[in-house]
Interface confidence: medium
């Protein structure tokens, strides 16, 4: 399943770097979230639970991020034009079932005033 | 499974259009392709198969295409500047398991000569 | 094409031990969960031991607790269960399976790609 | 830990009939973490349908599976030649996993 555009604010500037938000419904317990940069796996992150209710976050591909009971947050850093392009929330959810696979995204527009080093 | 760019030639232009080449590995039974603009579905081709291996196609979003045993071309007419976008081929296995997702896509550049209607 | 191949069983007597290997082939090893699961000659399934991705997290039936340790190696794309105390009880063949979503995890996952199976006799 | 009870133990049916198996758990089953899976005899389980109702890859629409809570069926619409095995449910919920008994759909 394909969601399309997602329809919340999905990048959310401050200091140089860029917080992309993907969100997940709060029901989702087992999920993939994966952040794509046009058809790159940028970042990686699987929480899945165990015995005892025991929760391991897997990530294959790392980058600094967040989680919450409805999100993850990637946090990408030092930013520059390069870093303009389609960003996707690439969300498997294994729990509850049935297995689905939702993708949202956007396009990151940098701005002069969002870079990290403006040349003065 | 996000594979990313995909490692062969994805657009073949002719006659001011493009054949959007989306690729499957042979041994892929059942599935379904979507083509995406950014984010958004364009196309969409579904092949199943029932008792006496009957092979059902269904196409929730239509556009012309074209099913070989190890792909599926999306055509697409009229080309202007607008058609500049990133692509994916967003295909999702059915058979043989395990259901799996594998995005592949690229940038689709419009060069003056590819147009369909070139200003004279 | 993927393939679970499981290895080591044959015949021991009660209280002797056994280790089984299975080993996957044309899979992402440590994208799954894995679990044994055994079926008595004749008999039902029973699930025995499941473990998650990178073996952090693993779990067992009540009948071999204590006996069974659930390992694995992803290094050698490989799960094993080492049996000890065994008892006639644990005559059986025995499946590995994998977990259907590719989740990592064993818990709260149904199995869809299993061995053939190896069977384990516990005799005097 | 949860036991799963099947019904029948056999159904005796013809090609082309229905079938409706049962399976019944001891205490609820949140969130329908059931399997269902087929068997024939010298091979492994073939999983059918996860989450009580959803159809795994490559399954024939045929089969389909319904229920919440403590009981859940399995329905085979039109019995092929091929369908004639035992049937187990599968409990994925709570610690230790448990499978019912089976039930066998042979050929009358």
């Known amino acids: 399943e394909i969601n399309g555009s997602a329809n919340y604010e999905m990048f959310i500037f401050h200091n140089g770097g860029v917080q992309i938000l993907c969100k997940y419904p709060d029901i989702v317990q087992q999920f993939k979230m994966q952040l794509l940069k046009g058809g790159q796996i940028l970042c990686d992150l699987t929480k899945t639970k165990g015995s005892g209710n025991k929760v391991s976050i897997k990530s294959l591909k790392f980058c600094h991020s967040q989680l919450s009971n409805n999100s993850v947050s990637f946090f990408l850093y030092n930013l520059d034009r390069s870093h303009a392009n389609y960003y996707f929330c690439n969300l498997s959810i294994f729990d509850p079932p049935p297995f689905k696979v939702t993708l949202t995204g956007g396009y990151l527009h940098i701005y002069e005033s969002q870079l990290c080093c403006q040349l003065k | 499974e996000i594979n990313g760019s995909a490692n062969y030639e994805m657009f073949i232009f002719h006659n001011g259009g493009v054949q959007i080449l989306c690729k499957y590995p042979d041994i892929v039974q059942q599935f379904k392709m979507q083509l995406l603009k950014g984010g958004q579905i364009l196309c969409d081709l579904t092949k199943t198969k029932g008792s006496g291996n009957k092979v059902s196609i269904k196409s929730l979003k239509f556009c012309h295409s074209q099913l070989s045993n190890n792909s599926v071309s999306f055509f697409l007419y009229n080309l202007d500047r607008s058609h500049a976008n990133y692509y994916f081929c967003n295909l999702s296995i059915f058979d043989p398991p395990p259901f799996k997702v594998t995005l592949t896509g690229g940038y689709l550049h419009i060069y003056e000569s590819q147009l369909c209607c070139q200003l004279k | 094409e993927v393939q679970l191949v499981e290895s080591g069983g044959g015949v021991v007597r009660p209280g002797g031990s056994l280790r089984l290997s299975c080993v996957a082939s044309?899979?992402?090893?440590?994208?799954?969960?894995m679990s044994w699961v055994r079926q008595a000659p004749g008999k039902g399934l029973e699930w025995v031991s499941g473990?998650?991705?990178?073996?952090?997290?693993?779990d067992y039936s009540d009948s071999v607790k204590g006996r069974f340790t659930i390992s694995r190696d992803n290094a050698k794309n490989s799960l094993y269960l080492q049996m000890n105390s065994l008892r006639a009880e644990d005559t059986a063949l025995y499946y590995c399976?994998?977990?259907?979503?590719?989740?990592?995890?064993?818990?709260?996952?149904?199995?869809?790609?299993w061995g053939q199976g190896i069977l384990v006799t516990v005799s005097s | 830990e949860i036991v799963l009870t099947q019904s029948p133990g056999t159904l005796s049916l013809s090609p082309g009939e229905r079938a409706t198996l049962s399976c019944r758990a001891s205490?609820?089953?949140?969130?329908?973490?059931l399997a269902w899976y087929q068997q024939k005899r010298g091979q492994a389980p073939r999983l059918l349908i996860y989450g009580a109702s959803s159809r795994a890859t490559g399954i024939p629409d045929r089969f389909s599976g319904d229920g919440s809570g403590t009981d859940f069926t399995l329905s085979i619409s039109r019995l092929e030649p091929e369908d004639f095995a035992v049937y187990y449910c599968?409990?994925?919920?709570?610690?230790?996993?448990?499978f019912g008994p089976g039930t066998k759909v042979d050929i009358k």
């Open positions: 205490q609820s089953v949140s969130r329908s973490y």
């Open positions: 044309g899979v992402t090893f440590d994208d799954y969960g």
């Open positions: 473990i998650n991705w990178n073996g952090g997290d693993t």
């Open positions: 399976a994998r977990d259907f979503y590719g989740s990592g995890s064993y818990y709260h996952v149904p199995f869809d790609y």
């Open positions: 599968h409990q994925y919920d709570m610690s230790p996993f448990t």
